[in-house]
Interface confidence: low
């Protein structure tokens, strides 16, 4: 077969297909460039358009910034001339790649600009509690689009020791199942570490005052987190799933995890934080169902049921 010389492959037409795009969540920091990625294939050659919050967005028109638009692609980088320029560009972006056969659309890319994090100034009243009772010291870090790390320390920058009795929750709060007079300190300080901005900020110190009693009263377990009897969660396939139960009581309750709907996937489950956290690596369809935590001590038990629905990522 002889193919005429004038025949070229580009006569075969292909509708656009997005081949590369930024992640759905993108966090930028005050000094970072903003880079949004959108690549697509197609014949005739694909052309690109962006929207921000549903409105036509033209990077090349933005004032006070330098824009580099990659040739033959929808990707662009914006470089600012001041430390806070990223705030201007927060929003939900979408890339459209089109040729005459049609249009392909990227997923929504939520661009979040993190400013320099600050804890609101507040007057922290001393927390007064009787020996043997439970208490929660709140952290409440400023909102952050990026994952941040929480540490509880004292004024000597020593970590607060955690065990079955004293636990930091996923939310950053410090939970005491029951307090001892040895917990009496005026300097419980919550530190928030923002890796992206390489910033550590600290909350005003909390003064925990423990009043001694002659006899500590035994109490059966009660869940401090979650506080209700059941909750429903959606887990994404292939993503990790973290379930948490923190209980109070005296003696200190122990936590057990059960799966009424079937065996616990032992090869993919880890227990952390003195059994208070169950982490399931790479969720699959078979992980759908009920997970139950049981807090027990010599006086009784408390439970929470997590109903997990697994969805495609």
């Amino acid at each position: 077969i002889q193919i005429p010389e004038e025949y070229e492959g580009h006569h075969v037409m292909e509708p656009p297909v997005i081949t590369e795009q930024s992640p759905r969540r993108l966090v930028v920091f005050p000094t970072d460039d903003i880079s949004l990625k959108c690549e697509a294939s197609g014949k005739p050659e694909v052309q690109f358009r962006w929207t921000r919050d549903g409105v036509h967005f033209k990077p090349k028109e933005e004032l006070g910034v330098t824009v580099y638009q990659s040739p033959h692609s929808g990707s662009f980088t914006i470089t600012g001339n001041n430390s806070n320029f990223a705030q201007r560009f927060q929003g939900i972006y979408r890339c459209f790649a089109s040729n005459k056969l049609g249009t392909a659309m990227s997923h929504e890319i939520r661009l979040m600009a993190e400013g320099a994090p600050k804890w609101p100034k507040e007057t922290v009243k001393p927390v007064e509690v009787e020996e043997g009772e439970s208490v929660v010291l709140p952290c409440n870090p400023p909102p952050s689009a990026e994952p941040l790390r929480i540490y509880w320390m004292n004024s000597k920058i020593l970590h607060i020791k955690q065990d079955e009795r004293v636990t930091m929750g996923q939310n950053g709060n410090l939970y005491f199942a029951n307090v001892l007079t040895s917990d009496n300190h005026s300097d419980y300080i919550c530190h928030a570490h923002f890796p992206g901005t390489r910033t550590i900020i600290q909350k005003e110190p909390i003064d925990l005052r423990v009043k001694a009693t002659n006899s500590m009263i035994d109490r059966k377990p009660r869940l401090l987190f979650p506080t209700n009897s059941s909750s429903h969660l959606v887990a994404l396939q292939g993503q990790p799933l973290v379930l948490e139960c923190i209980a109070e009581g005296f003696p200190t309750p122990t936590i057990k995890w059960l799966r009424p709907s079937g065996p616990m996937p032992a090869d993919r489950v880890t227990y952390q934080n003195h059994n208070k956290t169950l982490q399931l690596l790479k969720v699959g369809e078979e992980d759908d169902g009920e997970y139950r935590c049981l807090a027990e001590n010599s006086l009784g038990s408390a439970r929470h049921a997590y109903y997990v629905t697994v969805e495609a990522a």
Partner: antibody, heavy 118, light 113 residues
Framework: QVQLVQPGDELVKPGASVKLSCKAS????????MQWVKQRPGQGLEWIGE????????NYNEMFKSKAVLSVDKSVSTAYMQLSSLTAEDTAVYYC???????????WGQGTLVTVSS | DIVMTQSPSSLAVSVGERVTMSCKSS????????????LAWYQQKPGQSPKLLIY???TRESGVPDRFSGSGSGTDFTLTISSVKAEDVALYYC?????????FGQGTKLEIK
Amino acid sequence: QVQLVQPGDELVKPGASVKLSCKASGYTFTSYWMQWVKQRPGQGLEWIGEINPSNGRTNYNEMFKSKAVLSVDKSVSTAYMQLSSLTAEDTAVYYCALYDGYYAMDYWGQGTLVTVSS
Amino acid sequence: DIVMTQSPSSLAVSVGERVTMSCKSSQSLLYSSNQKNYLAWYQQKPGQSPKLLIYWASTRESGVPDRFSGSGSGTDFTLTISSVKAEDVALYYCQQYHSYPFTFGQGTKLEIK
């Protein structure tokens, strides 16, 4: 800001050729197709064709295939349209227009009036 | 080629009035896979280049006053000016970019009484 600069009027003789230019600035020249549009005096708009500055690829309106040749010079961010065998019918304003992805022409040059007259 | 037909060819209205103009295409401009209509509206004031007002039949170009709106789907489209201002005196063209060659309507001329 984006600018498409076209030269002023051109007076040419019937049968001759003319090469119109469109100098682009304020954006990445190779990232967007350049359109060319004809408007005869008191008439509507006609699409002549388009060129991709990054690789020189063109799409023409069949009506103009034997009349217009589109080209670019990336080194000076300029698009060109050569019109040949000119007749009175070619007397018109010729616009270059930038399109940034959906063919809608969102930046236009100010147009060059070509007058074909002996 | 897709033929674009605009009506009326001209209209005269008073300032503050609502205006609608029509554009019909000989083939559907709706691309089923993304439900977008590949139609744009342009405004051309006397002695000036055309200016993009609307794309995708109903999406206002950034910087265009919200008194301009586009509607319609398939083959029938409308440009509406909710409250005409004197500065809106111009020719208005629709254009399809669904298929090559891209084609324009013959225009609607808007005048003020």
